[in-house]
């Protein structure tokens, strides 16, 4: 065998005494829990489709890449993770498909390293509004997380609190300032119906922004002017109707951004005039090509950039489904 | 452009030392955890060393245990392998390579990805 | 240790010819391979890792397959830049171990 002449669990247990959800035992370097596999080689271990019901206690120190997919964790309690020593390079943790409904306060403390966290396919009916602050500090101490997959966290009717879904992962996004070096934030596939206006300005740093197949039915109240990084911002497969000047002027204000708007049933009236002028001159939209009317009966299908003023009239009647807005 | 380049390979007699170099430009070195691999004239790969980016962890192959030591110096963007009491078949080209591993990756594990051109280090009376 | 044997040492074949090598691990190591090719007087290139995925750059006649124990490294239509010395690599534990390499000759 190898000779470790430091071993890889030999992280300073200096940090401050963690709370009880910390393993007693340190983790010897080459050991693999139970129903795991592990490559320490790799800094990687995958806890995949077994059924586990709790987070795994004795997680090799050296972990960098931690994949706890389609298990039945149910909750995830404060301190999940945190063990002594820590798991000072956990930087990748994946727990989608494990059917979370409950992520509490803390529940990702103690991980300094963290960088990507996955927690999509989860019918989180309770994502506390600390989950990834850690505690209800105004100010948090920073995050280090970079990429946050939410893909499909909506849980069933039935399961939903009284409460706005929306709301409740927003709180979670802004609570305590503690991710504003987030730089991926994917929410596909969860049901949206509006955006908060505040949450993208508290996030400046995202780069990469995934609303895809929810039921956004329009933007106007969403400010993109503080996101100068955005390079690329997903609103395929939504409720769109139309995009209005404030926000054509702001999309086309930021220096790298593609953005992807294909599958909206785009309404096709005078109101359309200014989009279709803006996507007929931007480069900024990728397949704009391929965007085409919904609305009313008599454009449907007609591609958005081979419209004129002319075909752009307002008939004083919308479908039924269009007029919530 | 990345690049590892070696140094410090030559003949030696057997019971004396050498150290190898690899000078690093590139990419941001104290970010990635670093190999020494060997291979012996007409012989296959063998892997010889490990060191983490913040040279906190280290692994030998048990043939050069309490003779080799793998060692880094992050704000001079080098390896280092100091080779003891060498034997006639330490006789190899030794190649440094960066683990595919950064301190700021969180993706999969690529292996050994970049390699430099390779040392040779001749032990004979 | 974990030895890793590969099969075989050596093969002849034309351009166009589907090569298959494979590589056997004395225990189980789940995906945790990566295969190499090595030219004469040439640092070694990675190929595959995770015993089946296409590292970046590297062509598509290229693919691994196997999990456990046994591995298979496939070119579909060999090129002429293809000849070289393949090897597999296990990373399930250290120390990392090579297999003995496969040299693949122009027949």
């Known amino acids: 065998s190898s000779s470790p002449t430091s071993s890889a669990s030999s992280f300073s247990s200096s940090a401050p005494f963690l709370a009880s959800a910390v393993s007693a035992q340190p983790p010897l370097p080459d050991q693999c829990p139970a129903l795991c596999e592990c490559s320490e080689a790799a800094r990687t271990v995958k806890c995949v489709n077994r059924n586990l019901t709790e987070v795994p206690t004795d997680l090799p120190a050296y972990v960098r890449n931690l994949f706890l997919t389609g298990n039945q964790l149910a909750v995830l309690p404060a301190g999940a993770f945190a063990r002594r020593p820590p798991l000072a390079e956990l930087a990748a943790l994946n727990l989608s498909g494990s059917r979370l409904d409950e992520v509490r306060a803390g529940a990702f403390e103690h991980l300094p390293s963290l960088r990507q966290l996955d927690l999509s396919h989860n019918p989180l009916a309770d994502l506390s509004p600390f989950a990834f602050s850690g505690s209800n500090a105004s100010v948090s101490a920073p995050s280090p997380l970079v990429e946050l997959i939410l893909n499909h966290i909506v849980p069933p009717e039935d399961e939903r609190q009284n409460r706005s879904f929306e709301g409740m992962v927003v709180a979670a996004l802004l609570a305590g300032r503690a991710l504003q070096g987030l730089r991926r934030l994917e929410l596909a596939s969860n049901h949206f119906l509006y955006l908060p206006r505040d949450v993208l300005a508290q996030l400046p740093s995202l780069r990469h922004l995934d609303l895809s197949n929810n039921s956004l039915v329009s933007l106007t109240y969403v400010s993109f002017r503080n996101l100068t990084h955005l390079e690329s911002l997903h609103l395929e497969d939504n409720a769109l109707k139309v995009l209005h000047n404030g926000t054509l002027a702001e999309l086309q204000g930021l220096p790298h951004i593609r953005v992807f708007l294909d599958n909206n049933p785009w309404v096709c009236d005078c109101h359309m005039a200014d989009m279709v002028t803006w996507l007929k001159e931007t480069e900024v939209v990728q397949g704009k090509d391929r965007l085409t009317c919904a609305y009313p009966e008599k454009m449907r299908n007609r591609v958005l950039l081979e419209l004129n003023s002319a075909d752009l009239d307002c008939d004083p009647i919308l479908p039924p489904s269009l007029q919530t807005s | 452009q990345v690049q590892l380049v070696e140094s410090g390979g030559g003949v030696v007699q057997p019971g004396r030392s050498l150290r190898l170099s690899c000078a690093v430009s590139g990419f941001t070195f104290s970010s990635y955890d670093m190999n020494w691999v060997r291979q012996a004239p007409g012989k296959g790969l063998e892997w010889v060393t490990f060191?983490?980016?913040?040279?906190?962890?280290?692994y030998n192959a048990d043939s050069v245990k309490g003779r080799f030591t793998i060692s880094r110096d992050n704000s001079k963007n080098t390896l280092y392998l100091q080779m003891n009491s060498l034997r006639a078949e330490d006789t190899a080209v030794y190649y440094c390579?960066?683990?595919?591993?950064?301190?700021?990756?969180?993706?999969?594990?690529?292996?050994?990805?970049?390699w430099g051109q390779g040392t040779t280090v001749t032990v004979s009376s | 240790d974990i030895q890793m044997t590969q099969s075989p040492s050596s093969l002849s074949a034309s351009v166009g010819d589907r090569v298959t090598i494979t590589c056997r691990a004395s225990q189980g190591i789940s995906s945790w391979l990566a295969w190499y090719q090595q030219k004469p007087e040439k640092a070694p290139k990675s190929l595959i890792y995770a015993a089946s995925s296409l590292q970046s750059g590297v062509p598509s006649r290229f693919s691994g397959s196997g999990s456990g124990t046994d591995f298979t490294l496939t070119i579909s239509s060999l090129q002429p830049e293809d000849f070289a010395t393949y090897y597999c690599?296990?990373?399930?534990?250290?120390?990392?171990?090579f297999g003995g390499g496969t040299k693949v000759e122009i027949k």
């Open positions: 390579a960066r683990d595919s591993y950064s301190r700021s990756w969180y993706g999969d594990y690529y292996g050994m990805d970049v």
């Open positions: 060191i983490s980016y913040d040279g906190s962890n280290k």
């Open positions: 690599q296990q990373y399930n534990s250290y120390p990392l171990t």
